[in-house]
């Protein structure tokens, strides 16, 4: 009786169940009753992810330079090229198929997490107590200087953008 | 016990034809491919051709293709090999064997084809 | 056609001793591999089939190994039984092939 189903990594074809070609593998032929599943190995530059049937191998994928992009990891027989942006940028989407540049955090704003190449930069408000008088992707918010640590005295007060100004203690005549 | 017997086998002219059958018995032929692989004296195995349990498919070395044809009755749990234009090169023992997931587990006990004028 | 070529054509051992019979095909075949004893005037009989799977009723003395374009068929402990000629067929794509025979004869 002929299978109406296979195995797992098998394929009906003919009434008959056939092996499929391993990752790293493209089929050349179909099975018989007399032969297994022909298979060869993609070419280079080309790769198969899966178990396949597939008579041709996918290309590797190219980081294209002038898009920011550049190769994270080398596409194998049995896997794609994983491409990343350059310093500076970051991927758009998880399979990051453009750059776009880091973000700036404004000032009054600190740098929560630095971007990576996947993912933008994480500003945060600078709590009380706390400052950044730049633009920057990677500063984070500073703490005031604490006056009191060098005998001085607060003379104009913090704010989310600037700092304290210290100044000397009034001396008592 | 599976059983494979082969016959019509003798001396033929080239040019000639001949036509071996393979009675089988013992198993469910239906569900079985077969094959047929000769030896020429003195010499070694050479796969000839195949034919799938439902006759579907068949398959022929390229040295025997257009000349040969495989077929089955399984009615009659019979294989045969229709030889035509014969040639002195096909001199050999032909032997039926029974497939079972790509290899050949029963073989018969061969008969003797002599291509010669 | 993949081509079949086995090592040594033939090989004169004695009972007991340690046989090794190689196979070698002209592409990659996987473990698609099989291998036969025939006795003169006797049909072949399966003794191994996908490279190292041992027939029912084929004695443990016999075991086979390989994958790819090299294979060996191992006889642990010759038999006098055991003196007969041994062919590879592969099956990795068609036509099936065999190779030309290893012919194992007393020493």
């Known amino acids: 009786e002929p299978p109406t189903a296979c195995r797992e990594k098998q394929y009906l074809i003919n009434s008959q169940c056939c092996s499929l070609c391993q990752p790293g593998q493209k089929l050349v032929s179909d099975c018989t009753e007399f032969t297994e599943t022909e298979c060869l190995p993609c070419d280079s530059g080309e790769f198969s992810a899966q178990w396949n049937r597939e008579i041709r191998c996918h290309q590797h994928r190219h980081c294209e330079p002038n898009q920011g992009l550049r190769v994270k990891k080398e596409g194998t027989a049995e896997s794609d090229t994983v491409c990343t942006c350059e310093e500076g940028w970051h991927c758009t989407s998880e399979a990051c198929e453009s750059c776009v540049l880091h973000r700036s955090c404004s000032p009054g704003f600190g740098v929560k997490q630095i971007a990576t190449g996947v993912s933008d930069t994480i500003c945060e408000p600078c709590p009380v107590g706390f400052f950044s008088n730049v633009s920057s992707a990677f500063e984070k918010c500073h703490p005031w200087t604490s006056c009191e640590t060098k005998d001085l005295v607060v003379q104009q007060a913090g704010t989310n953008k600037t700092d304290v100004v210290c100044g000397p203690q009034d001396r008592l005549r | 016990e599976v059983q494979l017997l082969e016959s019509g086998g003798g001396l033929v002219q080239p040019g000639g034809s001949l036509r071996l059958s393979c009675a089988a018995s013992?198993?469910?032929?239906?569900?079985?491919?077969m094959s047929w692989v000769r030896q020429a004296p003195g010499k070694g195995l050479e796969w000839v051709s195949g034919i799938g349990g439902s006759s579907s498919y068949t398959s022929y070395a390229d040295s025997v293709k257009g000349r040969f044809t495989i077929s089955r009755d399984n009615s009659k749990n019979t294989l045969y090999l229709q030889m035509n234009s014969l040639r002195a090169e096909d001199t050999a023992v032909y032997y039926c064997a029974r497939y079972y997931s790509y290899h050949m587990d029963y073989w018969g006990q061969g008969t003797l084809v002599t291509v010669s004028s | 056609d993949i081509q079949m070529t086995q090592s040594p054509s033939s090989l004169s051992a004695s009972v007991g001793d340690h046989v090794t019979i190689t196979c070698r095909a002209s592409?990659?075949?996987?473990?698609?591999l099989n291998w036969y004893q025939q006795k003169p005037g006797k049909a072949p009989k399966l003794l191994i089939y996908?490279?190292?799977s041992l027939q029912s009723g084929v004695p443990s003395r016999f075991s086979g190994s390989g994958s790819g374009t090299d294979f060996t068929l191992t006889i642990s402990s010759l038999q006098p039984e055991d003196f007969a000629t041994y062919y590879c067929q592969q099956y990795g794509s068609a036509p099936p092939t065999f190779g030309q025979g290893t012919k194992l004869e007393i020493k």
């Open positions: 013992g198993f469910t032929f239906s569900s079985y491919a």
């Open positions: 996908a490279a190292s």
């Open positions: 592409q990659s075949i996987s473990s698609y």
